[in-house]
């Protein structure tokens, strides 16, 4: 089951997952003067069996123009504010090839794929928050946010973190304590603030279906 | 037949989605017919074949639009045309109420 | 282009009955299949995805089977409200493809 809304938004941090659950879909999008190919798909899937997770539909991109457009290209600043992503930083080597199971790890980079990642969590997944730059974590709990189905409806779990302006970075919570969260460890080190903006359903209570959003009509 | 017509669909109850739009139609008493996509947070649209070069996706963020534009039309692209939620593996989850379109000498 | 084929076209059965619909893709697509139903003058409605997995509200009558290229939809106990044509759709590769559809028709 898909998340219905995104991780809570706590001021002066940003979250991140250090692996994706199975069912976890990832936006498939080029930088600009780039697009998916043709046959591309729209998204990635985290999928697996038992013993293995990876993703599936690899995305894929090609010039848009018969030049090809090199220049990366940095999201303005209120497209950065609306998206909730932020740049993706250079990968590095993952810290423990071994996946928890059910599990993906970060996905590789794709050629010219965009500045930032947007994921679709599903319930279940953890997300772990760190202050930005220049802030610093009081923590009064678990600087963590979990997707959890309630009564038919997904929630993210409140982080107890609350992030301070004085000069000093904090870590993420799993590389202080590797111990404290099965999820602990990071699979990698890219640095991805991920989303997945979503429409509020309008449900009817007599209604078995959830009810069209969309209207549609002649330009 | 040769105009073009552009469809509008609007979603509302909620912020613009990050998950792609998809444009099906379906022709009177026939099947349903994937067009194209597009994910609305980027813009960049993907097109069925058989559509391509004459059908244009587009989004307004700003209005939490989606376009369809279909040129040269032809007396078999009438059809009522649906827009849709497409979570991709996981479908189209929420669907507009579909526009006629009748081409007519 | 992946193809889709479903069967049978019409299904003439009585409230009650159990109900299989069969669609079938030109080539593998693991799990990324979705069913709906629509009904006459009305969007889509969608039923299941991946393949056998329920949407929510969705009617614990209906149930989805199958992987790679051959899948069913099945009906335990055909209510009023199920007389509709069924689609398969397969969102593995552009284009997503549709089913050509089965409409399930009153006896």
């Known amino acids: 089951e898909l998340c219905d809304d995104d991780p809570p938004e706590i001021p002066h941090a940003t979250f991140k997952a250090m692996a994706y659950k199975e069912g976890t879909m990832l936006n498939c999008e080029c930088k600009r003067g780039f697009r998916r190919i043709k046959s591309g798909s729209l998204y990635m899937l985290c999928t697996g069996n038992s013993s293995h997770s990876s993703w599936d539909n690899q995305c894929q991109c090609t010039s848009s123009a018969t030049r090809n457009t090199t220049k990366q290209v940095t999201p303005q600043p209120e497209e950065q504010k609306e998206r909730k992503t932020t740049e993706m930083q250079s990968p590095m080597q993952p810290v423990d090839q071994a996946s928890l199971p059910g599990h993906c790890r970060e996905p590789p980079p794709w050629e010219n794929e965009a500045t930032e990642r947007i994921y679709h969590f599903v319930v279940g997944q953890m997300v772990y928050y760190q202050c930005v730059q220049g802030y610093r974590a009081l923590h009064r709990g678990p600087a963590e946010s979990v997707c959890k189905m309630t009564h038919g409806k997904t929630r993210w779990t409140q982080p107890q973190l609350i992030c301070t302006g004085e000069m000093e970075t904090s870590q993420f919570p799993g590389e202080e304590k590797p111990q404290a969260s099965p999820e602990g460890r990071p699979e990698s080190e890219t640095s991805c603030l991920v989303t997945t903006t979503d429409f509020q359903i309008q449900t009817e209570m007599a209604a078995t279906m959830e009810t069209s959003i969309f209207t549609t009509e002649y330009q | 037949p040769g105009s073009s017509v552009k469809v509008s669909c609007k979603a509302s109850g909620g912020t613009f989605s990050s998950y792609a739009i998809s444009w099906v139609r379906q022709a009177p008493g026939q099947g349903l017919e994937w067009m194209g996509g597009?994910?609305?947070?980027?813009?960049?649209?993907n097109y069925a074949q058989k559509f391509q070069g004459r059908v244009t996706i587009t989004a307004d963020k700003s209005t939490s639009t989606a376009y369809m534009e279909l040129s040269s039309l032809r007396s078999e692209d009438t059809a009522v045309y649906y827009c849709?939620?497409?979570?991709?593996?996981?479908?189209?989850?929420?669907w507009g109420q579909g526009t006629t379109v009748t081409v007519s000498s | 282009d992946v193809w889709m084929t479903q069967s049978p076209s019409f299904l003439s059965a009585s409230v009650g009955d159990r109900v299989t619909i069969t669609c079938r893709a030109s080539?593998?697509?693991?799990?990324?299949l979705v069913w709906y139903k629509q009904k006459p003058g009305k969007a889509p409605d969608l039923l299941i995805y991946a393949a056998s997995t329920l949407q929510s509200g969705v009617p614990s009558r209906f149930s989805g089977s199958g992987s790679g290229t051959d899948f069913t939809l099945t009906i335990s106990s055909l209510q009023p409200e199920d007389f509709a044509t069924y689609y398969c759709q397969q969102v593995h590769s552009f284009p997503f493809t549709f089913g050509p559809g089965t409409k399930v028709e009153i006896k």
């Open positions: 080539q593998g697509i693991n799990s990324y």
């Open positions: 597009i994910i609305p947070i980027f813009g960049t649209a």
């Open positions: 849709a939620r497409d979570k991709g593996y996981y479908g189209m989850d929420v």
